[in-house]
């Protein structure tokens, strides 16, 4: 063997190196890689160092046998059968309530005859649930609602005003609140005369009797 | 008649183990998973996790982690919940329930109590 | 964790008298489920899904709110009423009960 270059170095089971046929000298780059559904363990770069001797060990390749973490999922919950994913092992996700599940609940991960195991499915996704809407409320007599719907989506607000000659008793403006079931905030209002209203709060009426035989009232004031 | 049977009470060592046991009966135990609540003396609650009978899955609160170990056998259809390195703070009543969202059904409650 | 406030924290109550007591939550959720539970006695799931009766629960009860704000109402407290009552939630992991509310007869 020459003095003046590094060893030669192997191929390894279920990998190959690169470049194939290195030159030996000092500085020389070697890396192994394995083939699908193989890993490598130890390092996979090797250098020829000064003294002639490799920077590590030889490593090897071994066979992979479990799935990757497919990772949390907002909104949700999950259930980990084992937790380095091994063959067989299942993921369960239960999205927080007021979401809904869109995709697999459950995942299952799956040996392949060529290739690392994979999960039966990509993980789900939750998203909101959709608030009901409110029911749309009668305009109040003498007056009228605005928007005129018959269903306000959650979150959305009604303004209520009242036809001239009426005035307001109530809530001019109500809101739906989001829920479940979504409801409004207040009672719709009603629409009141105004000049009922103003007469009766501010005056008391005395009637006058006029006499049998007469035609003249005599008012009392 | 849904029912959760629960083992009796636990005198333990601090630094010791102990293992509870959950018995289900009145309905199909693989339909629905099994939690475990804490509950300390007159205080509120706490959820340490759960379990997927069919599955065996698992699902912990953070807190509880590495503290509690829960398991199923499907042929005889009970839940168990392990504590391990108990110290005085374990001591507690601990509920098996059944539940997704909301907890339907409540064991009798073990009490644990971890004195020297 | 979302955190729940409930106050209460200890109430009495005249038996006829209507009760209200309110379970407030650090960040909005979806639904909030209620549980009495009495002296020596597990919880009892009580009111679910926010406003739902569970099967056995007297009409008397209700309960509503919406994103941080709920509450349970009796509307004519009796006897057998004098319980504590817990919040829950599970609009977000891991699933959190309220601080208790204890009812007492007066």
């Known amino acids: 063997p020459r003095n003046d270059t590094c060893p030669e170095l192997p191929e390894i089971p279920n990998g190959w190196k690169s470049p194939s046929q290195p030159e030996l000298v000092h500085g020389t780059v070697v890396t192994y890689q394995c083939y699908p559904g193989y890993q490598v363990v130890g390092s996979s770069v090797l250098m020829c160092q000064w003294d002639l001797t490799w920077s590590e060990d030889l490593p090897s390749c071994q066979r992979v046998t479990s799935c990757h973490d497919p990772g949390d999922v907002e909104h949700s919950r999950r259930l980990i059968s084992s937790p380095k994913f091994p063959v067989g092992a299942t993921v369960q996700y239960i999205c927080d309530q007021g979401f809904v599940l869109m995709g697999s609940s459950i995942l299952t991960c799956h040996d392949r005859q060529a290739g690392s195991p994979k999960w039966s499915d990509r993980a789900p996704k939750c998203l909101l649930e959709q608030l009901k809407p409110c029911h749309g409320l009668s305009a109040p007599e003498n007056g009228a609602r605005s928007p005129e719907k018959q269903l306000h989506p959650a979150g959305a607000t009604i303004h209520f005003s009242c036809a001239p000659g009426y005035v307001l008793k109530g809530q001019a403006s109500i809101k739906c609140v989001p829920g479940h079931p979504s409801h409004w905030s207040d009672p719709p209002p009603i629409c009141r005369a105004a000049s009922l209203d103003g007469f009766y709060n501010s005056r008391s009426l005395d009637v006058a009797k006029a006499p049998a035989a007469s035609s003249t009232l005599d008012a009392a004031h | 008649e849904v029912q959760l049977q629960q083992s009796g009470p636990e005198l333990m060592k601090p630094g010791a183990s102990v293992k509870m046991s959950c018995k289900a009966s009145?309905?199909?135990?693989?339909?629905?998973?099994i939690h475990w609540v804490k509950q300390h003396q007159g205080k509120s609650l706490e959820w340490i996790g759960e379990i997927n009978p069919n599955t065996g899955g698992t699902g912990y609160n953070q807190k509880f982690q590495g503290k509690a170990t829960m398991t199923v056998d499907k042929s005889s259809s009970t839940a168990y919940m392990e504590l391990r390195s108990l110290t005085s703070e374990d001591s507690a009543v601990y509920y098996c329930v059944r539940g997704l969202y909301f907890f339907d059904y409540w064991g009798q409650g073990t009490t644990l109590t971890v004195s020297s | 964790q979302i955190v729940l406030t409930q106050s209460p924290a200890i109430m009495s109550a005249s038996p006829g008298e209507k009760v209200t007591m309110t379970c407030s939550a650090s960040?909005?959720?979806?639904?909030m489920h209620w549980y009495q539970q009495k002296s020596g006695t597990s919880p009892k799931r009580w009111i679910y899904?926010?406003?739902k009766l569970a099967s056995g629960v007297p009409a008397r009860f209700s309960g509503s709110g919406s994103g941080t704000s709920y509450s349970l109402t009796i509307s004519s407290m009796e006897t057998e009423d004098a319980a504590t009552y817990y919040c829950q939630q599970w609009s977000n992991t891991p699933p959190t009960f309220g601080s208790v509310t204890k009812l007492e007869i007066k």
């Open positions: 009145g309905y199909t135990f693989t339909d629905h998973n």
């Open positions: 960040s909005s959720v979806s639904y």
């Open positions: 899904d926010t406003s």
